[in-house]
């Protein structure tokens, strides 16, 4: 398994080598 | 062996403050995010949010913005829920589990939170 | 947001035969060529447990009878044989959209 998972589904994808932590590997950008 | 555990059953009173505790044990903190997962009365599985691990960065659903904190102590392995101004609608089970590149893979035991006069 | 719609919500199954749950999202979970939709069991008093993760992969130490299918929007989850011990409630979970969405449960009954 992946020695590192911080999201889980969308929040793990990377699109365009940018990390998705904050939301960019999902549909819906959410921010707190 | 990978665990979670949860700090135990809270009751409160309407308009105070609960912080839940889960520490995990048995792999890197840092490394995997922690999700929070409330279960209501009825059974009904509702996702929070998650804290990153690593920044400490927490990202909240829209259900759960403004009352409710996801907090560390990395030193400790801990993550922290904090529910602020409790009211009736907060009373559930709650779970923290780490985050899998698909799903959520291992969970905490659960903290029940009863809120009451 | 993304439903997950599950059925039956409850359902009893002779030991031995085969049971199956359906999940029907309102938007499709597939990305990239991947589902992003998990199956959990939960007894009670218990946390929910991973069974099965992007829609056919079975979790490290869950018995081979547990097996999922789909894509899209349309999945099941079949556990043939069933056991004593897989009495409990089944949920599915969509991963693919911010917020991830739960189905509302099956609860499975072995007669």
């Known amino acids: 398994s992946p020695k590192m998972v911080q999201g889980s589904g969308c929040f793990g994808r990377k699109m365009d080598r940018i990390s998705s932590s904050s939301g960019l590997g999902c549909k819906v950008l959410r921010r707190h | 062996q990978i665990q979670l555990v949860q700090s135990g059953p809270e009751l409160r009173k309407p308009g105070e403050t609960v912080k839940i505790s889960c520490k995990g044990s048995g792999y890197t903190f840092t490394h995997y995010g922690i999700n929070w997962v409330k279960q209501t009365p009825r059974k009904d599985l509702k996702w929070m949010g998650w804290i990153n691990t690593h920044t400490g960065e927490p990202i909240y659903a829209d259900d759960f913005k403004g009352r409710f904190a996801f907090s560390l102590e990395t030193s400790a392995n801990t993550a922290y829920l904090q529910i602020n101004n409790l009211n009736n609608g907060d009373m559930g089970t709650y779970f923290c589990?780490?985050?899998?590149?698909?799903?959520?893979?291992?969970w905490g035991q659960g903290t029940s939170v009863t809120v009451s006069s | 947001d993304n439903v997950l719609t599950q059925s039956p919500p409850s359902l009893a199954v002779s030991l031995g035969q085969r049971a199956t749950i359906s999940c029907k999202a309102s938007?499709?979970?597939?990305?990239?060529?991947?589902?992003?939709l998990n199956w959990y069991q939960q007894k009670p008093g218990q946390p929910p447990k991973f069974l099965i993760y992007?829609?056919?992969n079975l979790e490290s130490g869950i018995p081979a009878r547990f097996s999922g299918s789909g894509s899209g929007t349309d999945f099941n989850l079949n556990i043939h044989p069933v056991e004593e011990e897989d009495a409990a409630t089944y949920y599915c979970?969509?991963?693919?959209?911010?917020?991830?969405?739960f189905g509302s449960g099956t609860k499975l009954e072995i007669k």
């Open positions: 938007q499709s979970v597939d990305y990239n060529g991947d589902s992003y």
């Open positions: 992007a829609a056919s």
């Open positions: 589990t780490r985050s899998h590149r698909f799903g959520l893979d291992y």
């Open positions: 979970q969509q991963s693919n959209e911010d917020p991830f969405t």
